[in-house]
């Protein structure tokens, strides 16, 4: 049975779809080598937070500091790149937030395929100095494990030199990598020493080896590709929103609810109200009133604006979001002060990440 009693009929179907929503993708944090990086785990009510990188448990070391909900990486190197996750363990369930870290001063997986910095990798040699193949830019090859969300573009590079100019070929799991081995094939940019696969799928997972050779020798380098599958999820609400607010009688106030959803979200703003002097119905459930919902007559449903507030407007405001998979809700409190008291924001609004579940 429902866990509340509606004060009025709020049947909202069939609804007009809201104008926009966001397909969730992991937030990408980019740092240049040598920089420090700090990331906050944006999950609420975490009793215990654990961290992983590319699926492996992450513990503190001389460069990695874990303090509460913060992860700090000091003096980042390309090896720090990968798919990170923080998991908030609660008494009844757990929730995971994923994000990508990309430590690079060059193009890497998921970036635009148009190289702008690759020409310098094509090294021309004095024709008299015969030389076996060698790597010209090992920094671009340090990140061996690439964990990439499905549908992204992946680029592997093996910048090399030699005389005569070496040739490059690619193996997948130790065997010749043929165009027909994947739908859509792949691109090889010889002048940039790169292999490009667009719209990766789980079957693309595996080891990719570049073999660079000339008549004086052969070198190789292996990358491991892991494709992180997305699956549909119920709405996710940004931590810390809506934020508690206070205003004076007669003032205006705004609550914001930031929604991430794979599917059309239906947003409702709900408030606890009284009926006949009681906050609860005969069944013991609280009386709730739908103040605003996404639909044909609704402007930006993620924002609830209250104008010329009175003391009666004080109380808890709930942002409830549903899609075909499930629901999520978060609430905030409005404090209405007498006119002589100045209002103040009670909770800082944090920056908005995307999520992958």
């Amino acid at each position: 049975r429902p866990s509340f009693s509606l004060v009025e009929d709020t049947t909202l179907e069939p609804e007009e779809p809201p104008t926009k929503y966001q397909i969730s993708q992991p937030e990408v944090y980019v740092a240049a080598p040598g920089e420090s990086l700090e990331v906050r785990c944006l999950l609420k009510d975490a009793a215990v937070i654990s961290w992983t990188k590319d699926g492996v448990h992450l513990g503190p070391n001389n460069r990695t500091v874990l303090i509460g909900e913060y992860l700090q990486i000091k003096g980042a190197t390309p090896r720090d790149s990968g798919l990170y996750a923080c998991t908030a363990s609660r008494t009844v369930d757990s929730e995971t937030w994923y994000f990508m870290v990309n430590v690079t001063d060059a193009i890497s997986s998921g970036d635009d395929e148009d190289d702008t910095d690759g020409a310098e990798d094509f090294v021309s040699e004095n024709s008299n100095n015969k030389r076996a193949p060698y790597w010209t830019n090992t920094e671009k090859m340090e990140k061996r494990l690439h964990a990439v969300p499905a549908a992204n573009t992946v680029k592997f590079r093996c910048p090399a030199g030699g005389n005569p100019m070496p040739t490059m070929r690619w193996l997948k799991n130790g065997k010749e990598f043929k165009q027909e081995h994947r739908i859509g094939g792949y691109k090889v940019r010889n002048q940039h020493w790169s292999l490009i696969m667009e719209s990766v799928v789980p079957s693309d997972k595996g080891n990719y080896t570049c073999v660079v050779e000339n008549e004086y020798g052969s070198i190789n380098h292996t990358y491991h590709l892991d494709v992180v599958e997305r699956s549909p999820h119920r709405p996710i609400l940004q931590a810390g929103l809506p934020a508690n607010a206070s205003t004076v009688v007669g003032g205006d106030v705004e609550f914001v609810c930031k929604v991430y959803s794979d599917a059309q979200p239906h947003i409702q703003w709900i408030k606890h109200v009284e009926k006949n002097g009681s906050k609860y119905g005969p069944d013991g459930l609280p009386y709730l009133k739908v103040l605003k919902h996404s639909g044909i007559n609704s402007s930006n449903a993620e924002v609830l604006a209250l104008f010329n507030v009175t003391e009666a407007d004080a109380g808890e405001y709930i942002c409830k979001v549903s899609n075909y998979i499930g629901q999520a809700n978060q609430s905030a409190w409005l404090t209405v002060l007498p006119k002589q008291q100045a209002p103040g924001r009670e909770k800082e609004i944090t920056a908005s990440p995307d999520y992958l579940e």
Partner: antibody
């Protein structure tokens, strides 16, 4: 692993009611909607409604509003769909499905016949 | 209610063929469409969600595309085990409506 196990086949008289159960396991029952979908013999799929077990919120196809009642028992991780005022056209296989429609019950055949 | 018009209602193809099914919505539904495979006596099986995302474990020969009102489901190379009825479904607004189905047979 995720499983949805439905109650067995039923034969009902016109005008009576039927209550089909769907027991969930292998996931957090309160974190997903449970949908009910029916399929008449040789016909396509029709969505009846859904419930969010955590708070009991239910949503219905207008074609079934007033006749279908969807409930959930969190303590047993079981969802129920009751259909009243049965008629012969209600003869169908009734499926429950998890919120993402990735997992379905095996189906329950309800036959309405005098 | 949003009506989902699926075509063709049936089709016959040979193993190895490329098979395409279309679904048209009466209203724009962004990319909120799923595709299912159903074999006789079995529950439907989710193949594609959000128009183009293959569900976990679904072979890569199955793909989906489209946005707004027009959607396409493709089997790149038909296999004998793909013989089934395929349904599209919009999951944008309630009631979540299905297409009429496409029965796929082997020539």
């Amino acid at each position: 692993q995720v499983q949805l196990v439905q109650s067995g086949a039923e034969v009902k008289k016109p005008g009576s009611s039927v209550k089909v159960s769907c027991k969930a396991s292998g996931y957090i029952f309160t974190s997903y909607n449970v949908h009910w979908v029916r399929q008449a013999p040789g016909q396509g799929l029709e969505w009846i409604g859904s419930i969010y077990p955590d708070n009991g919120d239910s949503t219905y196809n207008q074609n079934y509003r007033g006749r279908a009642t969807i409930t959930a028992d969190k303590s047993t991780s079981t969802a129920y769909m009751e259909l009243s005022s049965l008629r012969s056209e209600d003869t169908a296989v009734y499926y429950c499905a998890r919120g993402d429609f990735a997992y379905w019950g095996q189906g329950t055949l309800v036959t309405v016949s005098s | 209610d949003i009506q989902m018009t699926q075509s063709p209602s049936s089709l016959s193809a040979s193993v190895g063929d490329r098979v395409t099914i279309t679904c048209k919505g009466s209203n724009g539904i962004s990319n909120d469409i799923a595709w299912y495979q159903q074999k006789p006596g079995k529950a439907p099986k989710l193949l594609i969600y959000s128009a183009s995302y293959r569900y976990s474990g679904v072979p890569s020969r199955f793909s989906g595309s489209g946005s707004g009102t027009d959607f396409t489901f493709t089997i790149s190379s038909l296999q004998p085990e793909d013989i089934a009825t395929y349904y599209c479904q919009q999951h944008s607004t309630t009631p979540y409506t299905f297409g009429q189905g496409t029965k796929l047979e082997i020539k």
